[in-house]
């Protein structure tokens, strides 16, 4: 029935960071196009990326509707120029993705140290609360808004003059740490979701050191 040169998509893979979520697959199309459908376990299928020659589809708009739901996607293959054509069973070839639960699986993006302020022997280090594409009441939520106390940050800090590191944790976006007066310190943070079993930790933030622009010093 005209689909002999159409191949099913394979290696369907979710790529997701801070809820920005793209489905990728293979192969690069030769004389065929793809359409993607996504649904929750109990929901209806919604079509996206119609008749595309791309091998990726941005599904962020769909998954941010409820990041705690589990989603399934499927990729349909059609002959180029004959998208009405169906397979031998009367429907186009398709392949299912693995299930994907954004809240449990989206990668934590590399955090950024927003600022640090020294007052005497205390330093307040603030982690930028990154905006996500998850919405509530028409406003975009931050990572902290979405994860709440499930998200913690680990701070690594050390004297610029030595290699010995210290660490502290917070389930807000701020650290208040003790430092030695007159010493410059460097800082790096990592996001962690302790309750997860996969994609638990982010990469470390870029290192920021006292004596550079982000900091402030007060007696």
């Amino acid at each position: 029935s005209g689909t002999t040169n159409t191949v099913a998509a394979y290696n369907l893979t979710w790529k997701s960071t801070n809820f920005k979520t793209i489905l990728e697959w293979e192969p690069k199309p030769v004389n065929q196009v793809y359409t993607v459908q996504i649904s929750t376990k109990s929901g209806d299928w919604k079509s996206k990326c119609f008749y595309t020659t791309d091998t990726e589809c941005d599904l962020t708009d769909e998954i941010v509707k409820d990041v705690k739901q589990t989603y399934l996607a499927r990729v349909f293959s059609y002959p180029a120029g004959n998208v009405e054509s169906t397979g031998s069973a009367g429907e186009p070839l398709y392949e299912n993705s693995p299930e994907f639960t954004p809240y449990l699986e989206t990668n934590l993006g590399q955090p950024t140290i927003q600022s640090f302020e020294q007052v005497g022997t205390k330093v307040n280090v603030t982690v930028e609360d990154e905006r996500t594409l998850v919405r509530r009441n028409n406003t975009f939520l931050s990572l902290r808004d979405v994860f709440g106390k499930d998200l913690i940050y680990t701070l690594y800090y050390w004297k610029s003059s030595s290699s010995g590191k210290k660490t502290a944790k917070t389930n807000t976006n701020e650290f208040l740490i003790d430092v030695d007066k007159g010493e410059n310190y460097c800082f790096s943070v990592q996001a962690v979701i302790p309750s997860r079993t996969v994609n638990r930790k982010s990469t470390d933030s870029p290192v920021e050191c006292m004596g550079q622009e982000k900091g402030e010093f007060r007696e």
């Epitope: 590191k165 502290a168 944790k169 389930n171 740490i177 309750s195 996969v198 638990r200």
Partner: antibody
């Protein structure tokens, strides 16, 4: 099933060195922090230090910083504790533990290190 | 460094008794406190985390409370298998520190 198995303990002379291993199975160590904790005979628990195996970041109790080194080999799913310039007071059972960042949920059975001439 | 002062260092109790162990931090550790049980010759076992969280498999007679600097582990009705040594651990900042331990013995 998550398991941690320490090895490498034994009798060593004062001033000597020893490398302890903590072989993990049932999970990937790079997804967690790994700690070493020790317990001298009849005494309480004492934290030695941690490693984030994914990036190699290490943190020590300052009293161990100069003599002990924690490392990890993610390809072997194993964490290590290298102990140098050992003293009689380092005699203890050494445990490795997995840290979720909220708690130490799995511990090894421990390996005994005896420092004596 | 944060010091953890655990008390009592030992106590004698009977099966069915309510037992309370306290840990006091030398400064605010927020919620970064967990409790461990250790039996002779065995590795410590997690009992309570984030002051109040209970891992799967831990009997409901174990509970935690407190915040900031003062924390409590309560065993509501002591069972024969609960005779052991209990430790608190602060892991909010390095160096992480354990309490000195509380040995719960049979009266």
């Amino acid at each position: 099933e998550v398991q941690l198995v320490e090895s490498g303990g034994g009798l060593v002379q004062p001033g000597g060195s020893l490398r302890l291993s903590c072989a993990a199975s049932g999970f990937n160590i790079k997804d967690y922090y790994m700690h070493w904790v020790r317990q001298a005979p009849g005494k309480g628990l004492e934290w030695v230090g941690w490693i984030d195996p994914e990036n190699g970041n290490t943190i020590y109790d300052p009293k161990f910083q100069d003599r002990f080194t924690i490392s990890a080999d993610t390809s072997k799913n194993t964490a290590y504790l290298q102990m140098n310039s050992l003293r009689a007071e380092d005699t203890a059972v050494y445990y490795c533990a997995r840290d979720t960042a909220a708690y130490f949920d799995y511990w090894g059975q421990g390996t005994l290190v005896t420092v004596s001439s | 460094d944060i010091q953890m002062t655990q008390s009592p260092s030992s106590l004698s109790a009977s099966v069915g008794d309510r037992v309370t162990i306290t840990c006091k931090a030398s400064r605010d550790i927020k919620s970064y406190l967990s409790w461990y049980q250790q039996k002779p010759g065995k590795a410590p076992k997690l009992l309570i985390y984030y002051e109040t969280g209970e891992p799967e498999g831990v009997p409901s007679r174990f509970s935690g409370s407190g915040s900031g600097t003062d924390f409590t582990l309560t065993i509501s009705s002591l069972q024969p298998e609960d005779f052991a040594t209990y430790y608190c651990l602060q892991h909010g900042e390095s160096p992480f520190t354990f309490g000195q331990g509380t040995k719960v013995e049979i009266k």
